[in-house]
Amino acid sequence: APVPPGEDSKDVAAPHRQPLTSSERIDKQIRYILDGISALRKETCNKSNMCESSKEALAENNLNLPKMAEKDGCFQSGFNEETCLVKIITGLLEFEVYLEYLQNRFESSEEQARAVQMSTKVLIQFLQKKAKNLDAITTPDPTTNASLLTKLQAQNQWLQDMTTHLILRSFKEFLQSSLRALRQM
């Protein structure tokens, strides 16, 4: 039954739609996370001048943020669905430690930071269902992640602000590339 009995007139259920496909839902999930990143970037850019800073290279040395490269098969030239999907999932798994770092970095957007972290976990689950070659996906080492987190949290205030900015920018770029690639699959 589309609507249970006792439906009141102001509470009419939404009309039946075609069920969401895997590709549609993954697309929506990535856009959900991108909107979350925009909200977090707004707070970061309002709080400090990091978004206009030219000293990014100083902080970037400490970070090994996932990036799409030609060999990953996600670009139009040399596109390879399976290789690309493995890269997207591996990259998202590598971003998780950085998203954990972000959790204590926001005052007024604490809930949004949590939502970005959790929605990324959900995206990984959705993509893993889609992937045929799960063996090729390497999971980051928890011990390495723990020491990286400690190192990042021990940085001075300026570097922490810059790290936050760089994580959000890189994650946004990675997701945008992923979105473009997934739309070709």
């Epitope: 589309p2 609507v3 439906e7 509470d11 009419v12 259920a13 939404a14 009309p15 039946h16 739609r17 069920p19 969401l20 895997s22 839902r25 929506k28 999930q29 959900y32 996370i33 909107d35 979350g36 909200a39 949004q112 949590r114 939502a115 959790m118 929605s119 976990k121 959900v122 689950q125 959705f126």
Partner: nanobody
């Protein structure tokens, strides 16, 4: 055929516990925000709990807060409603529903207990709390 199926209802004594499950056929439950609703005889249907598909956040009506827990297992494509410390006033037919209320970042969580946010409904399972 697209449908939702609830299970786990039954007769339980006041203070007891019961666990409801919601599964889908014809579509992937993991892709939808899920709400549990209930309707007692002669009363309006009310939303009791919901869980997002986007970030797994949850929402509870005041009447069940601290007693009911909603959760989901995306691997099993199932949503659960664990009901503890049940009271006679919890007696009702319990429905699960699936909708897309949670796909926009910054969605209002409390909207998820409004029935118009849902596309698919189950047939319901009876829960009776009585000694």
């Amino acid at each position: 055929q697209v449908q939702l199926v609830e299970s786990g209802g039954g007769l339980v004594q006041p203070g007891g516990s019961l666990g409801l499950s919601c599964a889908a056929s014809g579509f992937t439950l993991a892709y939808y925000g899920i709400g549990w609703f209930r309707q007692a005889p002669g009363k309006e249907r009310e939303g009791v709990a919901c869980i997002s598909s986007s970030d797994l956040s949850t929402y509870y009506a005041d009447s069940v807060k601290g007693r009911f827990t909603i959760s989901r297992d995306n691997a099993k494509d199932t949503v659960y409603l664990q009901m503890n410390s049940l009271k006679p006033e919890d007696t009702a037919v319990y429905y699960c529903a699936a909708g897309t209320w949670d796909l926009k970042f910054g969605y209002s969580r409390s909207n998820c207990v409004r029935s118009y946010e849902y596309d698919y409904w189950g047939q319901g399972t009876q829960v009776t709390v009585s000694s």
